[in-house]
């Protein structure tokens, strides 16, 4: 107690009213309005509770204080007075703020800012939308994955600031009058190869594929060491040359000379060379048959594999070179007598004739191409008169059938000797390697020495042995006619042809002519 | 007639490059190597190397790898031979010879001098 | 690489006489080319493949050998025939020429 007579135990937030008692401060209430004991407290009035009387008028918020309160603008509203705070509805000034006017950088980029009442929405340009954790912020809509699949399927969708594009895919172009780019767009695959704009080298063809293309090796070149066939970097190298080596076993400088002939034509052979490098390789052929120098002095059956190896080797050559020709025909003729007759077309439906020296070949043109060989036909005949030499004593076999005929029927059999050959050895070749069973046959004429009288005259092939070798045979080749100096042969396969003279003493009708052939 | 006709004389200095050219006519420029032989005064004949205008492959000896670039361009029947980071010893007359390996360097350009001199 | 190896360096002839110039390969060799140079002039090629000549060439000029020899023969010089002659093998990479052989007139 002091002397004045008031109470020193009144709560914090009251004031003494005697001695006594107490009363809370404005804006502070306690359980009962007279604090007689220093255990009650007094506590802040919420003048802004919902029950208060307290009204603060609209666009505007009530803020409680401690022992008090205060009006205030709400956000987006100010005070046309300047008053921060107020105590009642009669005086609030408040009004909206135009925060766009306020600050035009407010929905930053690619938004429009829209005024409301205490506040402000950002509405987004087309092509884009609110970014949920910043609804101030306007992003892309990426239409490309929004799966809207806003593009033509031959299209790929190209999604840009505010907008996307539909392009042609790599390798594809507008379709006639279709734009490149608007959402309307439609495309069509580029034929890179029939147009030009592909990259092939030169020793590969090119194929078009959808969107793209490759390059595959020539018919008869591999891919270079180390690099995929198929692609759009395939760079080849002619096999043909690589496989023509001597045969093994064999031990002849002459030949070995020929070989090497051919290896360096090979070694930096490009397509664009083939004209020269086969007249070369037949320049060749022809010295190495004009002087065969030592193979001369190897036994008759390695003579007869030498020309195996080189009949079978040449054809394939041959074969690979030409498909690197342009259209057209070729003759090339040399010292010795090797001839080479050669017709390269882009298909056509007709029948073929070469025209040499001492032969001439027929035969329909459909045959030369294999079936999706993109490369030009070629339809080619070499006489190798000088490969008699080598074909010397070369056995005939002949067909059991035939074989048995001729013994029945022949009673002046001649045993002794090998068949005669009248003719030039001639090969025939195709830009198709598959002629084991052509669909329509070829005719041969030959032209050849005189057929002794009462002798047999056969139409041959070389039919290339299991051992590298060889012997001549009929299968498949009839006889149609022969003259004295002419033949005329038919054959259901190709290879190398001649005309043989047996040795069988033929009666003045044949009766087994026709069975023979 | 086939006919090559090689670019005029060259005065280079140290260290610079050349461009020489070789353009053909009379003959199917891919049917044969370009080659290209140097000549330096008072010596013989040097192979460089040959580019085959098809494909603008190359082939080149060990000593002009780096030194010689050569290309061919099949629109205007040209071939090219650049000499990089010349030096006095480069001074020569350079040839172009369209070639065959069968039948060898048949048809030459007329050469063209290469001097080099700071 | 092939080394060709010309001999002689130098022949010293008269007009009329025969002419044999050799050329020697460090390995065998398929196709060996001859030319003909004279002071100032691009070479000319005189043999190809050994021994077939070329186009205009007169044939006075022949050429044989194989393997590693070859030689040059011009059967009566010319007074137009006194220049260099370079054989040049085309058989392997690098290709290579002779180092030349000068026939001059005695």
């Known amino acids: 107690q002091d002397s004045r007579g008031c109470a020193r135990w009144c709560p914090q937030d009251s004031s003494c009213v005697n001695a006594t008692a107490c009363r809370c401060n404005p804006g502070f209430s306690s359980f009962s309005e007279i604090i007689t004991t220093p255990m009650e407290t007094c506590d802040d009035i919420n003048e802004c509770a919902t029950l208060s009387k307290v009204s603060c008028g609209k666009f505007s918020d009530c803020w409680n204080t401690e022992g008090s309160y205060d009006c205030v603008c709400s956000p987006g509203y100010e005070p046309v007075s300047g008053a921060k705070t107020f105590k009642n509805e009669s005086e609030n000034t408040c009004q909206d703020v135009d925060e766009c006017q306020q600050n035009p950088r407010l929905c930053k980029s690619y938004g429009t800012c829209v005024n409301t009442l205490g506040s402000y929405t950002c509405q987004c340009l087309p092509g884009f939308k609110l970014k949920p954790e910043d609804p101030k912020l306007c992003t892309d809509v990426n239409e490309c994955t929004s799966g809207q699949n806003p593009c033509h399927s031959s299209t790929h969708c190209l999604n840009n600031v505010g907008s996307y594009q539909c392009r042609c895919r790599p390798g594809w172009q507008p379709i006639p009058g279709s734009p490149n780019g608007p959402n309307n767009t439609v495309c069509e695959d580029v034929d890179e190869c029939s147009s030009g704009q592909h990259q092939c080298d030169s020793s590969t063809v090119c194929f078009n594929t959808v969107g793209s293309y490759s390059c595959r090796c020539r018919p008869g070149w591999k891919p270079r060491h180390g690099i995929p066939n198929n692609q759009k970097d395939t760079v080849c190298e002619d096999m043909t040359f690589s496989t023509w080596t001597p045969p093994p076993g064999v031990h002849s400088q002459t030949l070995s000379r020929f070989f090497d002939k051919v290896q360096d034509l090979g070694r930096d052979y490009k397509p664009g060379l083939a004209n020269n490098t086969i007249q070369s390789i037949l320049q060749a052929l022809d010295e190495l048959l004009e002087a065969p120098g030592d193979l001369e002095t190897l036994p008759r059956l390695q003579q007869h594999c030498v020309a195996s190896h080189l009949l079978d080797g040449l054809e394939d050559v041959l074969r690979g070179l030409s498909k690197n020709l342009s259209n057209g025909l070729l003759n090339f003729s040399y010292p010795a007598g090797t001839e080479l007759s050669l017709e390269v077309q882009k298909q056509v439906d007709r029948s073929v004739t070469l025209r040499q020296n001492q032969a001439v070949m027929q035969l329909d043109w459909n045959q030369a191409q294999k079936s999706g060989d993109p490369g030009p036909s070629v339809v080619g005949l070499v006489s190798i008169p000088g490969m008699g030499k080598l074909l010397a004593e070369a056995p005939l076999v002949l067909e059991p059938e035939k074989q048995m005929l001729l013994h029945e029927t022949h009673q002046g059999l001649l045993q002794d000797g090998s068949p005669i050959l009248l003719s030039d050895v001639i090969s025939a070749f195709l830009s198709n390697n598959d002629t084991q069973n052509l669909s329509s046959p070829v005719t041969f004429t030959f032209s050849h020495r005189s057929v002794i009288p009462r002798q047999k005259v056969l139409c041959v092939f070389w039919e290339h042995g299991q051992n590298g070798c060889g012997h001549w045979a009929t299968t498949g080749c009839s006889t149609i006619g022969t003259r004295d100096t002419s033949t005329i042969c038919r054959c259901t396969h190709l290879s190398s042809f001649a005309v043989l003279m047996a040795h069988y003493d033929v009666q003045e009708e044949d009766p087994v002519l026709t069975v023979i052939t | 007639q086939v006919q090559l006709q090689q670019s005029g004389a060259e005065v280079a200095k140290p260290g610079a490059s050349v461009k020489l050219s070789c353009k053909a006519s009379g003959y199917t420029f891919t049917n044969y190597w370009m080659q290209w032989i140097k000549q330096a005064p008072g010596q013989g004949l040097e192979w460089i190397g040959a580019v085959y205008p098809g494909d603008g492959d190359t082939r080149h000896t060990q000593k002009f790898k780096g030194k010689a670039t050569l290309t061919a361009d099949k629109s205007t029947s040209t071939a090219y031979m650049e000499v990089s980071s010349l030096r006095s010893e480069d001074t020569a007359v350079y040839y172009c010879?369209?070639?065959?390996?069968?039948?060898?360097?048949?048809?030459w350009g007329q050469g063209t001098t290469v001097t080099v001199s700071s | 690489e092939i080394v060709l190896t010309q001999s002689p360096a130098t022949l010293s002839l008269s007009p009329g006489e025969r002419a044999t110039l050799s050329c020697s390969a460090s390995?065998?060799?398929?196709?060996m080319h001859w030319y003909q140079q004279k002071p100032g002039l691009a070479p000319r090629l005189l043999i190809y493949d050994t021994s077939k000549l070329a186009s205009g060439i007169p044939d006075r000029f022949s050429g044989s050998g194989s393997g590693t020899d070859f030689t040059l023969t011009i059967s009566r010089l010319e007074p137009e025939d006194f220049a260099v002659y370079y054989c040049q093998q085309w058989s392997s990479n690098p290709l290579t020429f002779g180092q030349g052989t000068k026939v001059e007139i005695k």
């Open positions: 010879a369209r070639g065959f390996t069968a039948y060898g360097m048949d048809y």
């Open positions: 390995s065998s060799v398929s196709y």
